[in-house]
C-alpha cells in the first residue's frame, strides 16, 4: 500500500501552504525507499536517492513557482509515481447567517471568510440548545446534533425543518479542505430571525364616488403556514405619483381604505408583514401596486349611515390553540372616521 496518506481532494494531488515547508510523498514505493525527484518535463534532478529523506521530497518555503507536477523514480529507474503540488491555505471560519420566513423552518447560508485556493466542502449540522438548571448546559441525546440538509447544486445553504419557535439552536458550519477544518458556531432563536415574506396579491382599487379614496387589499405570503398559530400584522405605505414621501398606516386586517388620496393622481401602494407579537423584523416591501381614485359620480344608492359601521368583525378566539388563517376579514368600510369632512360633503 502507498506510504502517502490520501488527503481529501482529487487523487494524485498533494497540498501545502505558501511560505511553509512542504513534504511531497512518492506514492508508488515502500515507506523509506530512496527515490529521485524531478519536475515533470525537466531533466534536472531536484533531490537524489542519497538525500536521506527516503520517499519524501522537502521543499523549503514553498511558493507559487513550486506548484505543478513532480515525478519520483526508484533506484532502478522505475516510475514511483507522479504527484501534483497545489498550494493554498487552511480554512478560516466561514461567515454564517440564518433567516426564517415562517415560524416552523429556517435556513442558514454561509460564505468563506477567506479563499483558501483549495478544494473545499462544508459540513452543516445543528443541535437544539437545552438549558438544564441555572447556568449548566448539558447535552442530552434528544438535542442532536442532527445534519442540516444542504441545498443541491452546491448552493451554500441548508434548511432546518420542523423547528420549535421557542427553542434556541446552535448551528455548526465547518469548512473543510485538505489542510484542515474550521468551525463557525452560531446561536439562533427563531423568534429573532423571523422575517416573513412580503404579502402577496396586492390590489389597489378606486372607491366609486369617492375621489379621495383607494381600497388596498392583499393576502398572506404563501410561505406562511396555512393554519397559523401566529398571525401577521401589516404596514401599508402609499404616495401619489411624483411625491417623494410615503404615508404609513398599520391596517387591522388584510385591507385598508385610504381616505386622503390626492384626487385624480395615480398612487403607489406597498405592504409589509411582521409577526403580530413583534418577533423578528418586518418583511421587505411587496412590489408596488398602483391605483387612481375614482373621478365618477356618487353611487345612486348609498347605504344608510348605520349599515356602514355595523359590519361583523371576525376575530380569532383567544383561547383557540390554532386560530384559522385570517382570510375572513372585516368587510370593507366605504366610510371611515378619518375623513368626516369628505363624508359630510358626499352625504349632504
Amino acid at each position: 500500500s502507498s506510504p502517502c496518506p490520501q488527503a481529501w481532494g482529487p487523487p494524485g494531488v498533494q497540498y501545502g501552504q505558501p511560505g511553509r515547508s512542504v513534504k511531497l510523498c512518492c506514492p508508488g514505493v515502500t515507506a523509506g525507499d530512496p527515490v529521485s525527484w524531478f519536475r515533470d518535463g525537466e531533466p534536472k534532478l531536484l533531490q537524489g536517492p542519497d538525500s536521506g529523506l527516503g520517499h519524501e521530497l522537502v521543499l523549503a518555503q514553498a511558493d507559487s513557482t513550486d506548484e505543478g507536477t513532480y515525478i519520483c523514480q526508484t533506484l532502478d529507474g522505475a516510475l514511483g509515481g507522479t504527484v501534483t503540488l497545489q498550494l493554498g491555505y487552511p480554512p478560516a471560519r466561514p461567515v454564517v447567517s440564518c433567516q426564517a420566513a415562517d415560524y416552523e423552518n429556517f435556513s442558514c447560508t454561509w460564505s468563506p471568510s477567506q479563499i483558501s485556493g483549495l478544494p473545499t466542502r462544508y459540513l452543516t449540522s445543528y443541535r437544539k440548545k437545552t438549558v438544564l438548571g441555572a447556568d449548566s448546559q448539558r447535552r442530552s441525546p434528544s438535542t442532536g446534533p442532527w445534519p442540516c440538509p444542504q441545498d443541491p447544486l452546491g448552493a451554500a445553504r441548508c434548511v432546518v425543518h420542523g423547528a420549535e419557535f421557542w427553542s434556541q439552536y446552535r448551528i455548526n458550519v465547518t469548512e473543510v479542505n485538505p489542510l484542515g477544518a474550521s468551525t463557525r458556531l452560531l446561536d439562533v432563536s427563531l423568534q429573532s430571525i423571523l422575517r416573513p415574506d412580503p404579502p402577496q396579491g396586492l390590489r389597489v382599487e378606486s372607491v366609486p364616488g369617492y375621489p379621495r379614496r383607494l381600497r388596498a387589499s392583499w393576502t398572506y405570503p404563501a410561505s406562511w403556514p396555512c393554519q397559523p398559530h401566529f398571525l401577521l400584522k401589516f404596514r401599508l405605505q402609499y404616495r401619489p405619483a411624483q411625491h417623494p414621501a410615503w404615508s404609513t398606516v398599520e391596517p387591522a386586517g388584510l385591507e385598508e381604505v385610504i381616505t386622503d388620496a390626492v384626487a385624480g393622481l395615480p398612487h403607489a401602494v406597498r405592504v409589509s408583514a411582521r409577526d403580530f407579537l413583534d418577533a423578528g423584523t418586518w418583511s421587505t416591501w411587496s412590489p408596488e401596486a398602483w391605483g387612481t381614485p375614482s373621478t365618477g359620480t356618487i353611487p345612486k344608492e348609498i347605504p344608510a349611515w348605520g349599515q356602514l359601521h355595523t359590519q361583523p368583525e371576525v376575530e380569532p378566539q383567544v383561547d383557540s390553540p390554532a386560530p384559522p388563517r385570517p382570510s375572513l376579514q372585516p368587510h370593507p368600510r366605504l366610510l371611515d372616521h378619518r375623513d368626516s369632512v369628505e363624508q359630510v360633503a358626499v352625504l349632504a
Epitope: 461567515v95 454561509w110 468563506p112 471568510s113 477567506q114
Partner: antibody, heavy 118, light 107 residues
Framework: EVQLLESGGGLVQPGGSLRLSCAAS????????MTWVRQAPGKGLEWVSS????????QYADSVKGRFTISRDNSKNTLYLQMNSLRAEDTAVYYC???????????WGRGTLVTVSS | DIQMTQSPSSLSASVGDRVTITCQAS??????LNWYQQKPGKAPKLLIY???NLQTGVPSRFSGSGSGTDFTFTISSLQPEDIATYYC?????????FGPGTKVDIK
C-alpha cells in the same frame, strides 16, 4: 508593496452622505474579507462593518445599521463604505483593514478623517 | 454583543520592566482574541492573534495567553519604542468588539 489606502473623507453636514474608498495593492484582494474600523478623536477603536470575499455576506455595527453600506469591487481591488444620514457621532478616522478570516485585521490603511458638523 | 474590558486603562513603567495587561470578555470567546498596538497618529498593528500566536515580524518580547473569558498580554522587557495604546479584540462573534485600550508610557 502590500498596502491599503483610504480616500473620500472630509467635512459633511449632519444628515449628509459620504462615500469612502479603500484601494488595495500587493495581495490577492478577492481572497480576503475586508473591514472598516473607526476611531473618534481621542477615543478607542470601533468596528463598523465587514464583507466576505464574494460580497455575499456583510455585517454592521448596530450604531450604523441601516445608514451605512459596505461593498467591494474585486475587479478594481477596492472596498467602499457608503455613509448616509451622517451624525455628529460618526466623526472619526475611518480605517480599512484586511483579514485573515473574519474579525482579525493584519493589514491596516492610514485612515481617512470624516468630520460631521454644521 | 460581547463586551470587552481592559485593565489598567493606563500604566507607566521603566525601560526593561515586565508589563502585563489583562482583558476580560463578557462571555466565553474560546481563544478568539487578538492584541493590537497603536502608536500616536498611526494605524493599529496586529501583534498577537488567537490569544497566544505571535504575528510574523513581531518581536518575541510580546506574548499573550488565556482562554475563555480571561486573557493576558505581556511585554517581557519594555522598550522605548513600545510607547503606545494596546487594544484587545474578540472575534469569536461575527460582530467583533474591541476593548477600551491601555495606554503604556515610560516613567
Amino acid at each position: 508593496e502590500v498596502q491599503l489606502l483610504e480616500s473620500g473623507g472630509g467635512l459633511v453636514q449632519p444628515g449628509g452622505s459620504l462615500r469612502l474608498s479603500c484601494a488595495a495593492s500587493g495581495f490577492t484582494f478577492s481572497w480576503y474579507s475586508m473591514t472598516w474600523v473607526r476611531q473618534a478623536p481621542g477615543k478607542g477603536l470601533e468596528w463598523v462593518s465587514s464583507i466576505v470575499p464574494s460580497g455575499g455576506h456583510t455585517q454592521y455595527a448596530d450604531s450604523v445599521k441601516g445608514r451605512f453600506t459596505i461593498s467591494r469591487d474585486n475587479s478594481k481591488n477596492t472596498l467602499y463604505l457608503q455613509m448616509n444620514s451622517l451624525r455628529a457621532e460618526d466623526t472619526a478616522v475611518y480605517y480599512c483593514a484586511k483579514g485573515p478570516g473574519w474579525g482579525s485585521f493584519d493589514l491596516w490603511g492610514r485612515g481617512t478623517l470624516v468630520t460631521v458638523s454644521s | 454583543d460581547i463586551q470587552m474590558t481592559q485593565s489598567p486603562s493606563s500604566l507607566s513603567a521603566s525601560v526593561g520592566d515586565r508589563v502585563t495587561i489583562t482583558c476580560q470578555a463578557s462571555q466565553d470567546i474560546n481563544n478568539y482574541l487578538n492584541w493590537y498596538q497603536q502608536k500616536p497618529g498611526k494605524a493599529p498593528k496586529l501583534l498577537i492573534y488567537d490569544a497566544s500566536n505571535l504575528q510574523t515580524g513581531v518581536p518575541s518580547r510580546f506574548s499573550g495567553s488565556g482562554s475563555g473569558t480571561d486573557f493576558t498580554f505581556t511585554i517581557s522587557s519594555l522598550q522605548p519604542e513600545d510607547i503606545a495604546t494596546y487594544y484587545c479584540q474578540q472575534n469569536e462573534s461575527q460582530s467583533p468588539t474591541f476593548g477600551p485600550g491601555t495606554k503604556v508610557d515610560i516613567k
